[in-house]
């Protein structure tokens, strides 16, 4: 996250870090206690996922292994729509007061809602320094409209813009597949943004997760 | 079709201010998502990034040259541009301008200008 | 600056042959790495992103494979316009460095 802040304790229960060996690979959102989401283009064979700390590489933070993922199957290594996927835990998550799900969407919130990002992705850019905390950002949401006059034809029909006008406030790599939270419920996954990260007025991406709500349910249910 | 095109001296003496600029047509240099770069080749050598502009005016340089490179952007006609101070024979060169996509999940150039030969001497 | 190195420097192959370059990363780029063909006197082509995506257009002879340090780039079977100037790129950090190419020959 560029520009923003650290997260308030445990106000981010349903976030989870998902690591390749002990490095941080993506972010992810708890959904079920199977079942975390996060953005397809982090993809890996296995997952070790960190759950209950907002400390990266945190000793006393469950650790659940997850070999199962199951990405859209309209997921374009091209243009990057649908960048969603499913992974299975292979054991269900012990949920606490540290560890909930979110909440899905029953609706897709308008232009100007008020949201937080949150992440432990670089910090900086184009020069890399990785937070051990996770770390926030406020943000609100843009209309299609006007993220397609700074993206054009970079932008899907499904995905979701966020930002703060002027300022340099963002997501960056190692937020991928993290949670946009508005009013409480999950609204967007972090998808991509400009590199070098945090260019005034080029907004984030994220997939919108509120057009999503049937997939995710569809495929939790198949692979119970 | 985005395409790029090189314009400037073809020869300048050492000491001299290399001075090239990009013309883009097919898209437009204020859009999102993309950067504007330079990049250089030596004759019969390989390819060298010399430093990139975004629609915002931001700008990176390889640091190997920063000191000596200055590159604009003029989105109303456009163009954008590359300056070299104080040349020598070391910087003869084919100089190409190029777009990348350049987003936090994937980066490449995926347009090139034809490139333009630009020799230093006296 | 992350060091790209590019082998072999040049190679000979006939028409038909299988031809393989490969691009090693001075440090794990991810699958940050773009490979590009350079015919005399033209611009660079890009024919493979994200170390294994064939760009659009590009015949399927072309491919790519590899992640952290170590890829691959094929041609399956080598065609006479394949003679070219082939090189790797590094997305992964600025300043992005190119290897030294491999020049194809036909023999």
């Known amino acids: 996250i560029i520009d923003g802040y650290k997260c308030k304790e445990g106000s981010h229960p349903w976030q989870v870090a998902l690591l390749k060996g002990n490095q941080l690979h993506c972010g992810g959102v708890l959904v079920d206690k199977y079942w975390v989401l996060t953005a397809a283009h982090c993809k890996m064979g296995q997952y070790q996922v960190q759950l209950g700390s907002d400390k990266i590489g945190d000793q006393s933070a469950q650790k659940i292994k997850a070999t199962k993922s199951f990405r859209h199957p309209g997921y374009s290594t091209k243009t990057h729509v649908n960048d969603i996927m499913l992974v299975r835990l292979d054991e269900p998550v012990k949920m606490s007061s540290k560890v909930e799900a979110v909440q899905l969407p029953e609706h897709c919130e308008p232009p100007g809602t008020s949201c937080t990002v949150s992440g432990w992705g670089t910090t900086t850019s184009p020069d890399v320094t990785f937070p051990s905390d996770l770390m926030c950002s406020d943000v609100k949401l843009i209309s299609s409209r006007e993220c397609k006059k700074v993206y054009k034809d970079l932008l899907g029909k499904t995905m979701l813009c966020a930002g703060i006008p002027d300022s340099k406030t963002n997501t960056c790599n190692g937020d991928s597949g993290g949670p946009l939270v508005c009013n409480d419920t999950l609204q967007g996954l972090v998808s991509w943004g400009t590199y070098p990260c945090g260019q005034p007025n080029d907004p984030g991406v994220y997939t919108q997760v509120c057009k999503y709500k049937r997939w995710v349910m569809e495929t939790m249910k198949t692979h119970r | 079709q985005v395409q790029l095109q090189e314009s400037g001296p073809g020869l300048v003496k050492p000491s001299q201010t290399l001075s090239l600029t990009c013309t883009v047509s097919g898209g437009s240099i204020s859009s999102g998502g993309y950067s504007w770069n330079w990049i250089r080749q030596h004759p019969g050598k390989g390819l060298e990034w010399i430093g990139s502009i975004y629609r915002s005016g931001s700008t990176y340089y390889n640091p190997s040259l920063k000191s000596r490179v200055t590159i604009s952007v003029d989105t109303s006609k456009n163009q954008f541009s590359l300056k070299l101070s104080s040349v020598t024979a070391a910087d003869t060169a084919v100089y190409y301008c190029?777009?990348?996509?350049?987003?936090?999940?994937?980066?490449?150039?995926?347009?090139w200008g034809q490139g333009t030969l630009v020799t230093v001497s006296s | 600056d992350i060091q790209m190195t590019q082998s072999p420097s040049s190679l000979s192959a006939s028409v038909g042959d299988r031809v393989t370059i490969t691009c090693q990363a001075s440090q794990d780029i991810a699958n940050y790495l773009n490979w590009y063909q350079q015919k005399p006197g033209k611009a660079p082509k890009l024919l493979i992103y994200?170390?294994?995506n064939l760009e659009t257009g590009v015949p399927s002879r072309f491919s790519g494979s590899g992640s952290g340090t170590d890829f691959t780039f094929t041609i399956s079977s080598l065609q006479p316009e394949d003679i070219a100037t082939y090189y790797c790129?590094?997305?992964?950090?600025?300043?992005?460095?190119f290897g030294g190419g491999t020049k194809v020959e036909i023999k």
């Open positions: 790129q590094q997305a992964s950090q600025l300043p992005f460095t």
């Open positions: 994200d170390a294994s």
């Open positions: 190029a777009r990348a996509k350049q987003l936090t999940l994937t980066r490449y150039f995926d347009y």
